[in-house]
Amino acid sequence: AGVFELQIHSFGPGPGGAPRSPYSARGPCRLFFRVCLKPGLSEEAAESPCALGAALSARGPVYTEQPEAPAPDLPLPNGLLQVPFRDAWPGTFSLIIETWREELGDQIGGPAWSLLARVTRRRRLAAGGPWAGDIQRAGAWELRFSYRARCELPAVGTACTRLCRPRSASRCGPGLRPCAPLEDECEAPPVCRAGCSLEHGFCEQPGECRCLEGWTGPLCMVPVSTSSCLGLRGPSSTTTGCLVPGPGPCDGNPCANGGSCSETPGSFECTCPRGFYGLRCEVSGVTCADGPCFNGGLCVGGADPDSAYICHCPPGFQGSNCEKRVDRCSLQPCRNGGLCLDLGHALRCRCRAGFAGPRCEHDLNDCAGRACANGGTCVEGGGAHRCSCALGFGGRDCRERADPCAARPCAHGGRCYAHFSGLVCACAPGYMGARCEFPVHPDGVSALPAAPPGLRPGDPQRYPHHHHHHHH
């Protein structure tokens, strides 16, 4: 057993300017941090729970955001973040640190939380070692922090697996550690076997070389995945042509907490009892009380403490702990070939030419998406649209004023007048009709349609607007 400790030294803009949050805080704010620990170094750890534990810091001092940018370094919460772990410290782990901002305004439903930054690092760390310092960038933010893993007595060693119970109350001096079992003194850390990998190995006893998870071989230089077939060295199996190990990997049952061990090629596998998991069943079941759901996810536990928890994630996040941002553009919300831009706080569609609307859903080349102004009518055809404009208007959308007399529609010297409902021809003597197209006989009777009742030859003739269109 032991405790992982994280100390945040500073959080603020990295070199190159002050970050702008995608959220604009309206009132006072304060920071807090979340830490999540996952065993192992594999890429799939991103989707796994915080199996080694999770912790939430206290809230930091209240500060007020400046309109232009945050203060150079934002005020931090006091104290360490501590994540207790049971049983063995795995040595290799993934560290996830989230910086959250809490807005203390008058929002409905209490303070608003927003994630400012998130760093994920895969690390190797022996328990009992010194503080390890780190500086990480998250977008335009910079986070400075230190961390260590320490065992809690009676556990000792780089994996906190060795139990040591001193029989006296003697205290160990600098550089010394609690005594070995059944001894009443302090001892110097053991000197490992010569050549034992500093990165992948450790020792509890002088001259030994024990391997961290994922490594094997006398000096812990061989990855587990390649250790089962070492070719011609050593006795080989007639069936596999692979090295037959001396002692079996399940010897001594490496599975903790009542787990059962079964051999696999070059390694072993633990079948864990309900409530435990991990490579060696060393991790006790995480519950909602451990706060495993990130990014505002809602934790729902089972009927009993051994049941797995489930995180119900808010929009924009996924993963068993809501720790992974959804690629919202993968849902292809933009229609008609528009470009999806995920701006964090919003999605935006940038449309191709000829399309418009929040999701590029309006085709500007069809009548459904466009109205013709000034009484014009939309006519579709050939995948495009055109406006048939009322008299006196023209242009793509009938928004431009047009001169109905520009085409000189009045025949035989008739004079054209623009009228609100169309054009009017004032015919020269001897002509009549809408365009003065009909000559008048000397006896006053027209050769073609008679003038409407009450309309004398020579009177202005109105030209109905529905005969005249501007096509574009």
Epitope: P13, G14, P15, G16, G17, A18, P19, R20, P22, R137, G139, A140, D327, C329, S330, G337, L339, C340, L341, D342, L343, G344, R348, R350, C351, R352, A353, F355, A356
Partner: antibody, heavy 122, light 107 residues
Framework: EVQLLESGGGLVQPGGSLRLSCAAS????????MNWVRQAPGKGLEWVST????????YYADSVKGRFTISRDNSKNTLYLQMNSLRAEDTAVFYC???????????????WGQGTLVTVSS | DIQMTQSPSAMSASVGDRVTITCRAS??????LAWFQQKPGKVPKRLIY???SLQSGVPSRFSGSGSGTEFTLTISSLQPEDFATYFC?????????FGGGTKVEIK
């Protein structure tokens, strides 16, 4: 800090090909749409092409459509512009740039590379 | 395609002058407009985004305004380092289009 560095420019004959690269650092490359913009000597700026963060969507200016291909390798944090059937009027400094939509999200560093000169001449 | 008409194309001004440059879009582009400054042989430098938001690190004498089709870049008191060419860019829809540029020269 955001940094963009173009390479691959040079002298090429009309009808020839060239491939420009843009190495990105200081930001999560795969999350951002990227652009190529060019500037002919003594002239204004002209947008050439855009690619989405995933690389699944591409957009081109009419002047280069069918001749240029934009692509990206997110595992290498690199943007590319394959230019075929080059013409004298393609002579320009080519810049890679983070899409302007993100100007209020990222702040540190340069959103445009320093540019690489492409000269098309016989 | 959206055309961006920038005016004037060139102007002479003195240190301390108030300078105004206009960009007109052929159709509405909301506030999807950015302004850039470019000096000879240099990379365009972003000044304004979202029509009126000042980019971090840019002096406050620069300001932008407008929405829809009419946009303005204003330099409240011209400084010696401000003599350069200024471009607007619309990124409302494809194809992205730049204004023709305004060269601000010393009177």
């Amino acid at each position: 800090e955001v940094q963009l560095l173009e390479s691959g420019g040079g002298l090429v004959q009309p009808g020839g090909s060239l491939r420009l690269s843009c190495a990105a650092s200081g930001f999560t490359f795969s999350s951002y749409a990227m652009n190529w913009v060019r500037q002919a000597p003594g002239k204004g700026l002209e947008w050439v092409s855009t690619i989405s963060g995933s690389g699944g969507s591409t957009y081109y200016a009419d002047s280069v459509k069918g001749r240029f291909t934009i692509s990206r390798d997110n595992s290498k944090n690199t943007l590319y512009l394959q230019m075929n059937s080059l013409r004298a009027e393609d002579t320009a400094v080519f810049y890679c740039a983070i899409d302007p939509e993100y100007y209020d999200i990222l702040t540190g560093g340069d959103y445009w590379g320093q540019g690489t000169l492409v000269t098309v001449s016989s | 395609d959206i055309q961006m008409t920038q005016s004037p194309s060139a102007m002479s001004a003195s240190v301390g002058d108030r300078v105004t440059i206009t960009c007109r879009a052929s159709q509405g582009i909301s506030n999807y407009l950015a302004w850039f400054q470019q000096k000879p042989g240099k990379v365009p430098k972003r000044l304004i985004y979202a029509a009126s938001s000042l980019q971090s690190g840019v002096p406050s004498r620069f300001s932008g305004s407008g929405s829809g089709t009419e946009f303005t870049l204003t330099i409240s008191s011209l400084q010696p380092e401000d003599f350069a060419t200024y471009f607007c860019l619309q990124h409302d829809s494809f194809p992205l289009t730049f204004g023709g540029g305004t060269k601000v020269e010393i009177k």
